[in-house]
Every structure is written in C-alpha cells, then in structure tokens.
C-alpha cells in the first residue's frame, strides 16, 4: 500500500506547502503516514511535512506533545495522520446560515 | 539499551576510498534519521550529513558532497557512509549518532567513533 | 546556511564557580538548539535540547536558556567532571552546524 504526502523538508515560512509541487509518493509498505510539524516564530508560522513509518511518527509527536501551544510563541506541534495528503490544508470552516 | 557502533576506519592514501558502517541496536533506524558527524585532529565537531532510512533520502555538508556518500540496509539496522576521492582534510574520528525527524529533537545517542587517517 | 558562533573559546575557572557559554545563530532558530560535553577521546554527550530542556541523567546544575538567535549554557557550581569542551548546535535547519566549543580548564 503506497500513500501519497505533502513534503517539505526545510521550514517554509507562512507557506504550507499543500500545493501539487510538494506532493510525493511515499515508500512501499515503510512510510504509512504523513506527518506535519507547525512552528510559531515571530517571523510567521513555519511548516515542514513529510512521509513517515507510524512508529516513527507517533514516537516523535509524543516525545514533542508539551512542546506544542498554538498561538504562543516557538509553539511547535507535530501531527500524524494516514490518509492520502492528510497533511495538507486545513479544511476551511463552512459558514452556516 | 541504544547502541550505535562504528566500524570500518583506518589508513587510507589520498584519492582512495573507505566505507564506514554504523551498526544500531536498541532501536530501529527506520524511526529515525542517521547522521554523521566528524572531528578532526584537535578541532571541533563538523556536520557531515544525514539519511532518513525509511525513504532513503539524504543531505550532505558542502565539504563532502559529490564524494561521500550515506545509505542504510534496514534488514541489518545499519547506516554506511561511503568515502571517496579522499583528502588528507578528512582525517577525523567519524562518529554516528540518531535523532528524530523533529526539529528541536537533539542527537541524543552516538557512537563510540572510528579513526580515519587520510595520508601517503 | 545557519552559522553557530560560539564564545568564548576557552575559559580558566575553578571548582564551585558559575559558568556561562553563549551561542549566537545567524538567524531565528526557535528553540532548535541543542548543548553536548566532550571530553578527549570520547563522544559528546548530549546535556541541554530544545534550548533550556535538560536531558535525562544530566545533573541539575546544568542549565539552558534562550531563544531566537541567542542561547545561554550556565553551570551552577562547576565540579571536577565538568572539565571539558561544549558545543552548542542549531537543528532548525540543514545543515545542522555546530559552534566552534568552548574549552572549561581548570585555574
């Protein structure tokens, strides 16, 4: 089973990169997540992504988790998900009406 | 209990080659980017490069890029950095240490290091 | 590249002094900052990571502050054991260079 991730290995700054430029494919049956880790400098918010083993993942947003304070400076928050380019874009919220 | 070991050093001429291995036991390599790091003679510590060997992918330092080379069997939970076109500025101890894919993770566990002496 | 520099390079001080050895980045690394000890003929060891977080095993008197551009390694109460050279690291981004160490002798 191959996966598909958005990957940026050095930190882009207030780009998320979730566009097609940034998409891989991810290594049969070893990378069976995408992972994300968002930074808060005072600068903007940084982003690198990338494919990753759910071991390797889960063992790195753990170690991390009390690193991760959104909307506070040098915030840092790693994230795992495994579905195809989960580690896009935010879905935007629908307004309702 | 993590352990890293180099292996593979020694005396070499320039212009020749040499291939490091960096055996790991404890851990899996997969979960975690490999790296290498080298301290000449009486110097400090000089970033050499990475591998994350779940995909295979690496980075070099400028010193060495387009002469060494990093790869990783995963079977054997091993790292190997691949010397050519050697010069006598990368006599060093080569040292192997892990760390995660995180960016405020640190190198937490190294190897012991390996002697390699590049001369005629 | 994100350069480290280091200082001093080397500093004389005496069992039960307070240490300080700063790094400077070349440019905003959050907190990506890591803080080894070597001693001669051994590997470094790793003492502070995250910039002020100390790692398992190390004793409390060291210590790591700082964030952005400028970290701070203090040791409280220098003992014996402490004789050695630290390095201060940046792994915001490749490559992950180290700063030139800092050499603690004894006065």
């Known amino acids: 089973l191959q996966i598909q991730c958005y990957q940026c290995e050095e930190f882009q700054l207030n780009n998320d990169c979730s566009s097609p430029e940034f998409i891989v494919n991810c290594t049969v049956n070893v990378q069976d997540m995408c992972q994300k880790e968002v930074m808060e400098q005072s600068a903007g918010i940084m982003y690198r992504k990338s494919c990753a083993s759910s071991a390797a993942c889960l063992i790195a947003s753990a170690g991390y988790q009390s690193f991760c304070s959104p909307g506070k400076l040098n915030s840092v928050c790693i994230s795992c998900c495994n579905t195809p380019l989960c580690n896009g874009p935010r879905p935007k919220k629908r307004g309702s009406s | 209990e993590v352990q890293l070991v180099e292996s593979g050093g020694g005396l070499v001429q320039p212009g020749g080659s040499l291939r490091l291995s960096c055996a790991a036991s404890?851990?899996?390599?997969?979960?975690?980017?490999i790296h290498w790091v080298r301290q000449a003679p009486g110097k400090g510590l000089e970033w050499v490069g990475r591998?994350?060997?779940?995909?295979?992918?690496?980075y070099y330092a400028d010193s060495v890029k387009g002469r060494f080379t990093i790869s990783a069997d995963t079977s054997k939970n091993t790292a190997y950095l691949q010397m050519n076109s050697l010069r006598a500025e990368d006599t060093a101890v080569y040292y192997c240490?892990?760390?995660?894919?995180?960016?405020?993770?640190?190198?937490?566990?190294w190897g012991q290091g390996t002697l390699v002496t590049v001369s005629s | 590249d994100i350069q480290m520099t280091q200082s001093p390079s080397s500093l004389s001080a005496s069992v039960g002094d307070r240490v300080t050895i700063t790094c400077r980045a070349s440019?905003?690394?959050?907190?990506?900052v890591a803080w080894y000890q070597q001693k001669p003929g051994k590997a470094p060891k790793l003492l502070i990571y995250?910039?002020?977080f100390l790692y398992s095993g190390v004793p409390s008197r060291f210590s790591g502050s700082g964030s952005g551009t400028d970290f701070t390694l203090t040791i409280s109460s220098l003992q014996p054991e402490d004789f050695a050279t630290y390095y201060c690291?940046?792994?915001?981004?490749?490559?992950?260079?180290f700063g030139q160490g800092t050499k603690v002798e004894i006065k």
């Open positions: 591998i994350y060997p779940d995909s295979g992918a690496t």
């Open positions: 690291q940046q792994s915001y981004g490749t490559p992950f260079i």
């Open positions: 995250s910039a002020s």
């Open positions: 440019q905003d690394v959050s907190t990506a």
């Open positions: 240490a892990r760390k995660l894919w995180v960016s405020l993770a640190p190198m937490d566990y």
């Open positions: 404890g851990f899996t390599i997969t979960n975690y980017g």
